[in-house]
Interface confidence: low
């Protein structure tokens, strides 16, 4: 139904009084500068707020910061600046919060110019207490926690040293010099690149990739001639310079760098780049930049080895290295991704895939929307989504698309309806089925967030004027109520809710401005009394994901299986609750050729689902390097799509061929690797 407050909208009874009793204001005794907010742990209610204020003096900049702590989801805050000895905290390092529910926090302090090293404040009790520690180095990066053990930290120094602590920052040891980039892998492994000659920049393309599995006691060189490296899912990628020219290629390892294979991806030149768009334990989406300053490239999807790639999407919008791409993983439905393409006429269009990059289509036009001026045909057009690129271009888009794994099927995004993205003021659209169908949810740009696993959606209008009104919906954005949370409007700066969308609290941040001063203020609203009762079985309904034709036996089959979810009925106004777990029932589907990708040396002719041998490779030695060794590759031409669970049905059996291969790239072969110990 169309948004609004017509008769069809069941209004929540007495919501003003209920919300007024649950609205908590906190005025911060602070001059307005910058504010950063971090949640400490999951479901703990602990929030840390760091405010900083710079006073530019004639000779130097004087900085002041304050630290506040809440343990009730932001309803009340306590000034705990004295716990960090009133020290000025460097905001560029942020607040380093430990993984999971470790309760660990590291703050990096500003120190005076002549000091021997930096200073950190450490807490391991959810910021109730802090310990000051002076460092034997000046940090260049934020402290990085090992995902497996929150006592293990690593940091790079301004002198390019790699420093490790095994006791949560109490004691530090430099384990390697001349380090450019370092990352934690699995099992407390550290991967890092080193330079030999002058600097990271000078040695780009001649770096070495190292690994230590024992926090610096011993090392192994696992790659040379490295340009860069990255981790994604269970894959380790290295971009390696070719022997003869300035091109480079991607090599991939699934055993922490012991053995490498050359990815069957195009090589790139000096001005081009590779980018891992998304990765999981099954596969990876890889963007390969086009030659020249085109602003686009090609998306490839990998097989389960990360070696064989299928072209997924042409003309994928991605500006220069480290630039902007709209590629978005829709986390509320398996297999769904949204991104933008740059068409021949330089307009930008949104594409969506429901099957992990197998096929891409335009987004269906919302039923309650008209095609805008970009549409050639006023009856036929698509929805186009504003994401990172639009935000970078300073369009009136306050937020990127939003989805949450536990709010099944819900996607919220700014968009326009036409033949391409429009520069006009966008509206907010919602999908409740993972992107198959869309409805205009709110007129004009808004900030939005999902609470109680989708039971409540909250929005605030994006305006340059002070605001005092919040909107909320209990039926997935069909109907909206408005609530005035304060008499005195504030200059709005952001909405904050606990990550994971399980909370029923929302904090509205902003500042008040008077003739003399401006102060930070937050309003935390608890919606628990709006959703008065806990949801029961009758409040949920069965929903088949990816359903497009209920009469078709294969309806809902994506990557070899279909999933039925129990979803909250739109008409039910009740609490999913913090312990809500998504209930889903998978059913295995029959295999079809769509469940297979073509193996190396094979391709799919257009509009054909069969894999045929590439004519140019018939009878040739193939440029295919598996684990860096000369060996036969046997294939039947098909390989199951990563993560595909189909059974029975079509089983493509082909004559097994020996694809003779030579290793044209063996910079990463095992015999070139070496080890050393400290």
């Amino acid at each position: 139904s169309a948004p609004g407050e017509d008769e069809e909208c069941g209004r929540v009874r007495d919501f003003v009084a209920k919300l007024a009793n649950n609205t908590h204001q906190h005025v911060f005794d602070d001059l307005r500068g910058s504010v950063s907010l971090s949640w400490v742990g999951d479901s703990t209610g602990v929030i840390l707020v760091l405010t900083t204020f710079h006073v530019p003096l004639v000779i130097m900049t004087f900085g002041q910061s304050k630290l506040y702590r809440s343990e009730d989801y932001g309803k009340n805050f306590k000034d705990i600046t004295d716990l960090i000895n009133n020290t000025f905290i460097r905001t560029e390092f942020g607040m380093a919060i430990g993984p999971e529910n470790s309760g660990k926090v590291v703050l990096t302090a500003e120190v005076s110019g002549g000091s021997r090293g930096g200073r950190i404040f450490r807490s391991s009790d959810f910021a109730k207490n802090f310990v000051q520690t002076d460092l034997p180095f000046h940090p260049l990066t934020q402290m990085m926690y090992s995902p497996q053990n929150s006592d293990y930290l690593l940091a790079l120094s301004t002198e390019n040293g790699l420093w490790v602590s095994k006791n949560f920052g109490g004691k530090w040891e430099e384990i390697h010099k001349a380090v450019c980039l370092a990352k934690w892998g699995s099992d407390n492994t550290i991967f890092f690149t080193t330079y030999a000659n002058g600097s990271c920049k000078a040695d780009l393309g001649a770096l070495e990739l190292w690994r230590t599995s024992d926090l610096g006691k011993s090392f192994k060189t696992i790659g040379v001639k490295i340009y860069s490296f990255g981790l994604g899912g269970r894959f380790l990628f290295a971009s390696v310079m070719a022997d003869k020219d300035t091109t480079r290629r991607i090599h991939v390892s699934t055993d922490q760098g012991d053995t490498w294979s050359m990815a069957q991806l195009p090589s790139v030149g000096q001005e081009q780049f590779y980018s891992i768009l998304a990765a999981n334990d099954d596969m990876v989406f890889m963007h390969v930049d086009e030659p020249g300053d085109t602003g686009f490239g090609t998306i490839f999807t990998s097989d389960d080895r990360g070696i064989v790639y299928s072209k997924s999407l042409d003309r994928h919008l991605y500006t220069t290295t480290g630039g902007e791409t709209d590629f978005t993983n829709v986390t509320s439905l398996r297999g769904v991704y949204i991104t933008s393409v740059l068409s021949e006429d330089n307009s930008i269009q949104t594409m969506i895939t429901f099957d992990q990059g197998g096929r891409w289509t335009h987004l269906r036009k919302p039923e309650n929307s008209e095609c805008d001026a970009t549409a050639k045909n006023k009856n036929e057009c698509s929805l186009h989504i504003h994401a990172s690129y639009s935000i970078s271009q300073k369009l009136n888009v306050p937020m990127a698309p939003l989805s949450e794994p536990n709010a099944v099927g819900i996607v919220i995004a700014h968009g326009s309806v036409g033949d391409a993205i429009s520069v006009m003021v966008p509206d907010v659209y919602i999908s409740d089925d993972g992107g198959y169908s869309w409805t205009k949810m709110l007129e004009g740009p808004h900030y939005y967030t999902i609470l109680d696993s989708g039971g409540i959606i909250v929005a605030i209008e994006h305006s340059s004027r002070p605001i005092n009104v919040i909107k909320f919906s209990t039926d997935e954005g069909q109907c909206w109520q408005t609530y005035t949370f304060t008499r005195d409007p504030i200059y709005f700066t952001g909405l904050a809710s606990e990550p994971g969308a399980r909370s029923m609290n929302i904090s509205i941040w902003g500042f008040t401005e008077s003739f003399l001063t401006s102060q930070w203020v937050s309003y935390t609203i608890d919606f628990k009394d709006i959703l008065e009762r806990n949801c029961e079985e009758k409040d949920y309904t069965i929903w088949l994901a990816h359903s497009t034709d209920p009469e078709d036996y294969e309806d809902g089959c994506i990557l070899g299986y279909k999933e039925q979810f129990l979803r909250l009925r739109k008409s039910s106004v009740c609490q999913n609750g913090r312990d809500y777990v998504v209930t889903k029932q998978p059913s295995i589907c029959l295999c079809s050729l769509e469940d297979f990708l073509c193996d190396f040396g094979y391709y799919r002719p257009e509009n054909d689902s069969k894999c045929v041998e590439q004519p140019e490779l018939k009878g040739h030695d193939l440029e295919f390097c598996l684990y860096g060794r000369e060996e036969h590759l046997t294939t039947n031409g098909y390989r199951k799509i990563p993560g595909d669970k189909c059974q029975g049905g079509v089983n493509p059996v082909r004559e097994v061929k020996d694809l003779k291969k030579k290793c044209t790239s063996n910079f990463l072969s095992p015999e070139k690797q070496n080890s050393k110990s400290n």
Epitope: I542, L544, Q564, Q585, L590
Partner: antibody, heavy 118, light 107 residues
Framework: EVQLVESGGDLVKPGGSLKLSCAAP????????MSWVRQTPDKRLEWVAI????????YYSDTVKGRFTISRDNAKNTLYLQMSSLKSEDTAMYYC???????????WGTGTTVTVSS | DILMTQSPSSMSVSLGDTVSITCHAS??????IGWLQQKPGKSFKGLIY???NLKDGVPSRFSGSGSGADFSLTISSLESEDFADYFC?????????FGGGTKLEKR
């Protein structure tokens, strides 16, 4: 009205073959998956095979795999079950049943009797 | 294969009674279960799908409940046309499997 009518059941010797048909007037046959289910003399039900709406995909129970073939002719609105290498344990009343993604045994036929005996 | 254990195999009941038939799946099947009715000498009729959903045209005295591995079909206020055999069927995964059936007989 949706109806399914099976035919082709007969008395056949072990090792013999038989082809069952299921006529499906009254609905858009080509948009539904179809199953064969049999009911043994002791009234137990056993799912035999399924075929997708377009006929591209088939799946069989282990007891009939390699011996039975399910197929369909959407132009004729007819479902088939080709049975070969028949055994005495294949003796049953055979029903065809309409499937959809939401409900696999939606509408049933009246059944046809297959007896395998020497 | 998923084994569907249906009980009781038969029961004697009177008009107006409320009866419950249960089915236990050997592994979790969420709500992927249906209930069928077979009248003597006749074919089958679908009653309930997805565990709890009543098929169009089926009287509201029939209801289904349960999810995971334990399910039941309840007939409240039994009528004369309800004396029949009832079967559960799981369609969570291949091969689809049926319960052994429950015969409702007149007391």
């Amino acid at each position: 009205e949706v109806q399914l009518v099976e035919s082709g059941g007969d008395l056949v010797k072990p090792g013999g073959s038989l082809k069952l048909s299921c006529a499906a007037p009254g609905f858009t046959f080509s948009t539904y998956g179809m199953s064969w289910v049999r009911q043994t003399p002791d009234k137990r039900l056993e799912w035999v095979a399924i075929i997708s709406s377009g006929g591209s995909y088939t799946y069989y129970s282990d007891t009939v795999k390699g011996r039975f073939t399910i197929s369909r002719d959407n132009a004729k609105n007819t479902l088939y079950l080709q049975m070969s290498s028949l055994k005495s344990e294949d003796t049953a009343m055979y029903y065809c049943s309409r499937s959809s993604s939401h409900w696999y045994f939606d509408v049933w036929g009246t059944g046809t009797t297959v007896t395998v005996s020497s | 294969d998923i084994l569907m254990t249906q009980s009781p195999s038969s029961m004697s009941v009177s008009l107006g009674d409320t009866v419950s038939i249960t089915c236990h799946a050997s592994q979790g099947i969420s709500s992927n279960i249906g209930w069928l009715q077979q009248k003597p000498g006749k074919s089958f009729k679908g009653l309930i799908y997805h565990g709890t959903n009543l098929k169009d045209g089926v009287p509201s005295r029939f209801s289904g409940s349960g999810s995971g591995a334990d399910f039941s079909l309840t007939i409240s206020s039994l009528e004369s046309e309800d004396f029949a055999d009832y079967f559960c069927v799981q369609y969570a995964q291949f091969p689809y499997t049926f319960g052994g059936g429950t015969k409702l007989e007149k007391r």
